[in-house]
Interface confidence: medium
Amino acid sequence: AGSDSPYVPCAPSPCVNGGTCRQTGDFTFECNCLPGFEGSTCERNIDDCPNHRCQNGGVCVDGVNTYNCRCPPQWTGQFCTEDVDECLLQPNACQNGGTCTNRNGGYGCVCVNGWSGDDCSENIDDCAYASCTPGSTCIDRVASFSCLCPEGKAGLLCHLDDACISNPCHKGALCDTNPLNGQYICTCPQGYKGADCTEDVDECAMANSNPCEHAGKCVNTDGAFHCECLKGYAGPRCEMDINECHSDPCQNDATCLDKIGGFTCLCMPGFKGVHCELEVNEGNSGLNDIFEAQKIEWHENLYFQGHHHHHHHH
């Protein structure tokens, strides 16, 4: 029993929440609490909500030596004193293009034609007053309606005969009926023009520019055109520079340089020729060999200009 360690009131400290323990007697202590706490061991968080200043229906939420206000949706700020401008919220408080007017503790909406309700979310049924021709179907839209016409009828109210029935548009053109007068309108595919899309568009004669690049020759065709390319170019509009090096024309580990309409071979020492296919004469040696190799490199444009011929198919 004698081995029991003596009781020390403040070791360990019974004070919680940051309270400081002070021994007041052999077996007694006192806790000095941090602001916001009370009790013999500082165990209680003092309710800071009495005399709170939350306004406009804000609810006081106690904290440690402070409090916060939980505001209703129409109010904000530390004490719910700042009006929420619902008109600045995203998405807009007024739907469907309605004009929002902020008010203290609320908002109002002025709706555009076709919408109603507090937030302009209700679409007014325009079909209730519509005059679609009997046999057609009315579809309600925003501040308007549209009539879905039966086969053979056209126009805003389906009161006109459909001019597209006779297939007046050619070359696969799209046919529409003018909703005002019932006449057909052809939307021509590329390469054709005219009321019925029967006229060919001469792309080569268009004012803006030649459709063929790199001086290619434009040839008009029915509904289209094609380009005849200069040597060294390919593609529908001669837009591609042919890489003559793709066919590996240079021999003996030479380096191939692509040129417009041709190529150049940079020979390794000891070789020459358009394709570096010839061996340099072995008779010269030493410095002469080096000089010859340099001469070949310097004058490669003169000696080794090679061409691959490109054939055009029309």
Epitope: N32, P35, E38, I46, D47, D48, P50, N51, R53, Q55, N65, T66, Y67, G77, Q78, F79, T81
Partner: antibody
Framework: QSVEESGGRLVTPGTPLTLTCTVS????????MSWVRQAPGKGLEWIGI??????TLFYASWAKGRFTISKTSTTVDLKITSPTTEDTATYFC??????????????WGPGTLVTVSS | AQVLTQTASSVSAAVGGTVTINCQAS???????LAWYQQKPGQPPKLLMY???TLESGVSSRFKGSGSGTQFTLTISGVQCDDAATYYC?????????????FGGGTKVEIK
Amino acid sequence: QSVEESGGRLVTPGTPLTLTCTVSGFSLSSYDMSWVRQAPGKGLEWIGIIQAGSNTLFYASWAKGRFTISKTSTTVDLKITSPTTEDTATYFCARGGVIFIIGHFNLWGPGTLVTVSS
Amino acid sequence: AQVLTQTASSVSAAVGGTVTINCQASQSVVNNRLAWYQQKPGQPPKLLMYGASTLESGVSSRFKGSGSGTQFTLTISGVQCDDAATYYCQGEFLCSSGDCVAFGGGTKVEIK
């Protein structure tokens, strides 16, 4: 951080007087400000408070209608609407010691003397 | 209106002695938000204690506050000449039921 009162002077009864408390080193949007007065040889008397954030005003029951408190971003004013000789006192401006809680006052100005006499 | 009563308007103490000043509230002080101030002639009040028992920073630990509800006490131990002053209690009350703040009438401490 400091507060300082100004505007105290000799006035005749019934002449409105406005005292100004100028603060520096802290924001009036966070701390409550109270006006307290002390008649010569008497005790401290709380007049009223303007609360931070909400800007709510509270006055002592005896002070209602006799005083008006208002504030700007750096000053707090006390208007004595119709002074009487009983309003002769040193007027103190005091800052609340805890943000958004009335509690106690841990920063006081030196005071400004108002004398009301005909 | 809420009232704080300091029973003794003045007390006398010897240097090194102990002074006890009582403050009684007419109704419960909000969360024991009761403060004590020291005021010397020609000066503004100086905060000593708040929350009934929390010592303000820089104030001597010879000052001790206690109490709760409506009864509060300020104790000055090892009284010094510099402690000669008038001491005021001040409490916070529910604003909804009257005055938010009230001061006691003051207790003047004289040193023998």
